[in-house]
């Protein structure tokens, strides 16, 4: 699901106020949720009827410095005798996250929101159309 | 997926540098890629073998302010006949995300990084037994 | 150790509805499904649909849509049945049943049951 | 849906006696599952994916067959056996029960 823009009116204060200094803001440390978590290891990916691999991407410049890629492993969707099935599809469900870029010149240190395209896994559809002749 | 714990030092100076003062720090306002586009295929909830309906939760104090969650339709998976497979099921397909929350007391506006669990799409699986008794 | 408390008997009146809980301890809620069974005096038990709080996805007996509506609240680990327009013929036990996770085990495999409510309808 | 029919509906038998109850399927399924329903009890699950025994069950009971026609079999019969039996399919939407068959004892 798709983010919606900025507009930049979200970290702006009141009309009222005086302007944010230098084009920043004030970003606390701590993250609200930190322990919340995931019920997902459950090896969904390989049981799927369309499954995926996951592939890591590591930056020490952004946090979360690890972001796990899904990608499809077959066209088809796997059927109930484990044989790939051409009349369906295995489709990327993707969903669009923020993460935090971390800026450093020496000590001085900033950080900036940036937008990931994150494919969280794959689900397997009926095409609309089979043939475009 | 699951996103790891900060251990605060992504967000921390480097050692040889002077203690971000009142444990927050600076964040530039603009958000990288915010022109990214999600480029799923359409109405694959709909098209699903594990088909969901999406809600929307809204918060104007969030960062984005729409989050969208994925519930899944059926318990089990629908088959080539349009009829539900009570031998498979449709599971969600969960992702942590960053959002960011707003707080604000007057004109002293600060802003803190939030862990949310988005259920993004359902998929089929088989499960990896039948019975636990 | 997995208990399903449901709620009292009901005597209701023809055209009614009714709405029965079945509160659970011993496990994790979210991570089960459950399902609802009528048996109506001394007959033959009937699935009328189950819930997954988790995923969200509900399955109903189509015999039963419109007349059974199942429901889940998260934070008391309870699930719900609202039965509608109640005639005669809906006088019976309702079980609650603890179905699989989907995971590891079929939402559709039952293996813990509610103590049953008996719901009677007459005027 | 499909449709299960136990046979018998009630039967009467002696402690020690081989008792047999089949379910028929209107439609061929994968697996069945078997319930025992004692008077005023729940129904606790007794045989499960056909002929795997549940915890906790006694070895005298057993499960057989395949496609339409399936069975369960006690092979001694004993006092506290006393209950309505149910088959259940579990193949296809809904899951549907047989009309039960009651089982005393003589």
């Known amino acids: 699901r798709k983010i919606p823009k900025v507009g930049h009116t979200f970290f702006q204060k009141p009309e009222s106020c005086p302007p944010v200094p230098g084009g920043s803001m004030k970003l606390d440390i701590g993250i609200i949720n930190e322990n919340q978590r995931v019920s997902m290891s459950r090896n969904i990916e390989s049981r799927s009827t369309s499954p995926w691999n996951y592939t890591v991407t590591w930056d020490p410049n952004r946090y979360p410095s690890e972001v796990v890629q899904a990608q499809c492993r077959n066209l088809g969707c796997i059927n109930a005798q484990g044989k790939e099935d051409i009349s369906m599809n295995s489709v990327p469900i993707q969903q669009e996250t923020l993460v935090v870029r971390r800026k450093h010149q020496g000590c001085s240190v900033s950080f900036q929101l940036e937008k990931v395209l994150v494919t969280v896994g794959c689900t397997c559809v009926t095409p609309v159309i089979h043939h475009v002749q | 997926r699951k996103i790891p714990k900060v251990g605060h030092t992504f967000f921390q100076k480097p050692e040889s540098c002077p203690p971000v003062p009142g444990g927050s720090m600076k964040l530039d306002i603009g958000i990288i890629n915010e022109n990214q586009r999600v480029s799923m295929s359409r109405n694959i909830e709909s098209r699903s073998t594990s088909p969901w309906n999406y809600t929307v939760t809204w918060d104007p104090n969030r960062y984005p302010s729409e989050v969208v969650q994925a519930q899944c339709r059926n318990l089990g998976c629908i088959n080539a006949q349009g009829k539900e497979d009570i031998s498979m099921n449709s599971v969600p397909i969960q992702q942590e995300t960053l959002v960011v929350r707003r707080k604000h007391q007057g004109c002293s506006v600060s802003f803190q990084l939030e862990k949310v669990l988005v259920t993004v799409g359902c998929t089929c699986v088989t499960p990896v037994i039948h019975h636990v008794q | 150790e997995v208990q399903l408390q449901q709620s009292g008997p009901e005597l209701v009146k023809p055209g009614a509805s009714v709405k029965i809980s079945c509160k659970t301890s011993?496990?994790?809620?979210?991570?089960?499904?459950m399902h609802w069974v009528k048996q109506s005096h001394g007959k033959r038990l009937e699935w009328i649909g189950g819930i997954n709080p988790n995923s969200g996805g509900v399955s109903y007996n189509q015999n039963f849509k419109g007349k059974a509506t199942l429901t889940v609240d998260k934070s008391s680990s309870t699930a719900s049945m609202e039965l509608r327009s109640l005639t005669s013929e809906d006088s019976a036990v309702f079980y609650c049943a603890r179905g699989g996770d989907g995971y590891y085990t079929n939402y559709f495999d039952i293996d813990y049951w509610g103590q049953g409510t008996s719901v009677t309808v007459s005027s | 849906d499909i449709q299960m029919t136990q046979s018998p509906s009630s039967l009467s038998a002696s402690v020690g006696d081989r008792v047999t109850i089949t379910c028929s399927a209107s439609s061929s399924v994968n697996y069945m599952h078997w319930y025992q329903q004692k008077p005023g009890k729940v129904p606790k699950l007794l045989i499960y994916?056909?002929?795997k025994l549940a915890s906790g069950v006694p070895s005298r009971f057993s499960g057989s067959g395949s496609g339409t026609d399936f069975t369960l079999t006690i092979s001694s019969l004993q006092p506290e056996d006393v209950a309505t039996y149910y088959c259940q399919q579990w193949n296809s939407h809904p899951l549907t029960f047989g009309q039960g068959t009651k089982l005393e004892i003589k």
């Open positions: 994916d056909t002929s």
């Open positions: 011993g496990y994790t809620f979210n991570e089960y499904t």
